[in-house]
Structure formats: structure tokens, C-alpha cells
């Protein structure tokens, strides 16, 4: 599968391969998470919409020195077409709403599993 | 705690269709993949099919050549496999499936099956 | 389609014993193995996921291995109640498929 069903997006769509690889890793932070992620950190909020992957990346690339989500941050700049650096800013985020990041991830986890299923079975 | 509570046993002439409930419990349905599962007197397991409840797209084994149909109603969380152009052999109990696929597998939770006898 | 060949289709086996059950895929199915445990009458109940995770519950006894395309699932020391149908599933890519199934008896 290399397009996932209701998901338009401005470059490419990651195969099902690699759409359930980030997945498994959002799942082990979850599962591993221990103190609070990150110490807490915050970042933007994303509308979970077309061009999620670039915008999930510019929030979470503004979080340094957390190794928990490196491989994350490194997954995510495959997905996404351009160059990513921090202090972007996408109009995909929620300029007023900062969350934690482990409700970042959290959220994100969700949807990319609600993806996963649409491109499943569509 | 996770249910899944399916119709009961049912009693069909040949050509005839059956549609057997699975209604769930205990998650939110759309969360999760749903699956139906054969298995034949004294034989193993066959996956049928599956679908996925929020969107209603459908997946299926091609050996039930178009005789299966799956569905879900997402207002009675409960959902459907119908089986049609029924023969002898489809004589089986019918397993409903669901689990979060990256938690505890697609097959994590079983309904308690119906028992379908195809008989003239 | 991929195909699962589960071995031995039955075996017999004493309390205490150790037993493993393997499975073969005729592809790569990315540790997507599921396995799980039949009695006469009851529906399959789910034992291990993801090829070697232990479902919630389940005792520690049983465990799971393998990758690429050979599965394993072993059982340290048989228990009574042990004494069940075991079926491999690889959930990598439609159509889902199963092994034929392993008969565990009592020696």
C-alpha cells in the first residue's frame, strides 16, 4: 500500500511498511514512558490533517536533548518532503494550544493507527 | 472488560444465506479491526475476512469466492458476516475476532462462535 | 497468499516437559505471528502477539521467538491444563493466514 485511504497530502505518503514501523515506535515510547516524557516538554498542537507529517515534525524538532523521540523525529523527516529545521512554523499547527509531548504523541498515535486500518481495508 | 457475544446457532438448507451477529463491549468498536474466523468439524482455523468498523471497508479471502459479506453498525456496535450460497461444507462454527493490531494483535478477542449446520 | 506450516501436527508429551511448537512462513511476516491455544468446544484464546510478546495474563511459561520467516513457540514446563490445540496466525498482509495446528496429548 503506498497511499492511505481519506489521507491527501503534499508529498509522499509513507507505505505501509513504514506507516506501521512509526507506529511501533510511538507505541514503545507509550509503553517504555516512565518519568514524564521528555521532562515534560511542551510543543504546538497539529490539526491531524494533510500535511500532518511535516507539521508534526516542525513541533516535535523544537524539542532537543530528548532521546527518547530521536528515532521519531528521524521517521517523521522521511515522511516529509521538504527540510525541516527548528522554529518552523506550519499553519497546520494550533498557533494558541502547547501540549505535552506525550499527549503530542499520544494524539498522533491514534490517528496514524486510524490511518493504518483505513489503508488496510480500503 | 472486553465481550464480544455472537447470535446463535443456526439451521440452513443448501443455497440458503446466514448472517451471524458479534456484538461488542467493553472498547470503543471503531477502535479496532473486526474479523471473522471458520472452523470446520475436527478442522483448523480460516480467516474469512475483515473489516474495519469506522470506515466500513472490507477485506476478504478469495476461497469464499464473493459468498461472504461483512458489515458493521457502528449505532448497536455490533457487526455482521453473512454467508451465502450455502453447501455441506460450509457446515462450521463461525468466530467473531478484534485487538488493537500494535497492542495484543487483530486476534486478542474471541466471541464464543455459532455453530451453522448446512443440511438438506 | 502466504502459507504457514505449523510442526508437528501432534505430539505427546508428559507434564514437566518442555515443548516447542514451530511455525513457517513462505515469506517474511515481520514477526506479525500470532499464537494461540484451542481446548474441545471453546473458542481460540490468544497466548502470544508480535511473535514473542506475552498477551496480559497469560503465564510465563509460555514464550515466543523467531523473525524473517520461522516461528517458535515454546512452552518450558507443561502444565495439566496445557493440554490443547496450538495454532500459529501471521497477520504481515492479507489474506491473514493460519498453521494447520498442533495437537499437544498427554504421553
Known amino acids: 500500500l503506498t497511499c492511505l485511504g481519506g489521507f491527501a497530502s503534499p508529498g509522499p505518503v509513507p507505505p505501509s511498511t513504514a506507516l506501521r514501523e512509526l507506529i511501533e515506535e510511538l507505541v514503545n515510547i507509550t509503553q517504555n514512558q516512565k518519568a514524564p516524557l521528555c521532562n515534560g516538554s511542551m510543543v504546538w498542537s497539529i490539526n491531524l490533517t494533510a500535511g500532518m507529517y511535516c507539521a508534526a515534525l516542525e513541533s516535535l524538532i523544537n524539542v532537543s536533548g530528548c532521546s527518547a523521540i530521536e528515532k521519531t523525529q528521524r521517521m517523521l523527516s522521511g515522511f516529509c518532503p521538504h527540510k525541516v529545521s527548528a522554529g518552523q512554523f506550519s499553519s497546520l499547527h494550533v498557533r494558541d494550544t502547547k501540549i505535552e509531548v506525550a499527549q503530542f504523541v499520544k494524539d498522533l498515535l491514534l490517528h496514524l493507527k486510524k490511518l493504518f486500518r483505513e489503508g488496510q481495508f480500503n | 472488560e472486553v465481550q464480544l457475544v455472537q447470535s446463535g446457532a443456526e439451521v440452513k438448507k443448501p443455497g440458503a444465506t446466514v448472517k451471524i451477529s458479534c456484538k461488542v463491549s467493553?472498547?470503543?468498536?471503531?477502535?479496532?479491526?473486526m474479523h471473522w474466523v471458520q472452523q470446520a468439524p475436527g478442522k483448523g482455523l480460516e480467516w474469512m475476512g475483515g473489516i474495519d468498523p469506522e470506515t466500513g471497508g472490507t477485506a476478504s479471502n478469495q476461497k469464499f469466492k464473493g459468498r461472504v459479506t461483512i458489515t458493521a453498525d457502528k449505532s448497536t456496535d455490533t457487526a455482521y458476516m453473512e454467508l451465502s450460497s450455502l453447501r455441506s461444507e460450509d457446515t462450521a462454527v463461525y468466530y467473531c475476532?478484534?485487538?488493537?493490531?500494535f497492542g495484543g494483535g487483530p486476534f486478542a478477542y474471541w466471541g464464543q462462535g455459532t455453530l451453522v449446520t448446512v443440511s438438506s | 497468499d502466504i502459507q504457514m506450516t505449523q510442526s508437528p501436527s501432534s505430539l505427546s508429551a508428559s507434564v514437566g516437559d518442555r515443548v516447542t511448537i514451530t511455525c513457517k512462513a513462505s515469506?517474511?511476516?515481520?514477526?506479525?505471528l500470532s499464537w494461540f491455544q484451542q481446548k474441545p468446544g471453546k473458542a481460540p484464546k490468544s497466548l502470544i502477539y508480535?511473535?514473542?510478546r506475552l498477551v496480559d495474563g497469560v503465564p510465563s511459561r509460555f514464550s515466543g521467538s523467531g523473525s524473517g520467516q520461522d516461528y517458535t513457540l515454546t512452552i518450558s514446563s507443561l502444565q495439566p491444563e496445557d493440554f490443547a490445540t496450538y495454532y500459529c496466525l501471521q497477520y504481515d498482509e492479507f489474506p491473514y493466514t493460519f498453521g494447520g495446528g498442533t495437537k499437544v496429548e498427554i504421553k
Open positions: 475476532a478484534t485487538g488493537d493490531y
Open positions: 467493553g472498547y470503543t468498536f471503531t477502535d479496532y479491526e
Open positions: 508480535r511473535a514473542n
Open positions: 515469506q517474511d511476516i515481520n514477526s506479525y
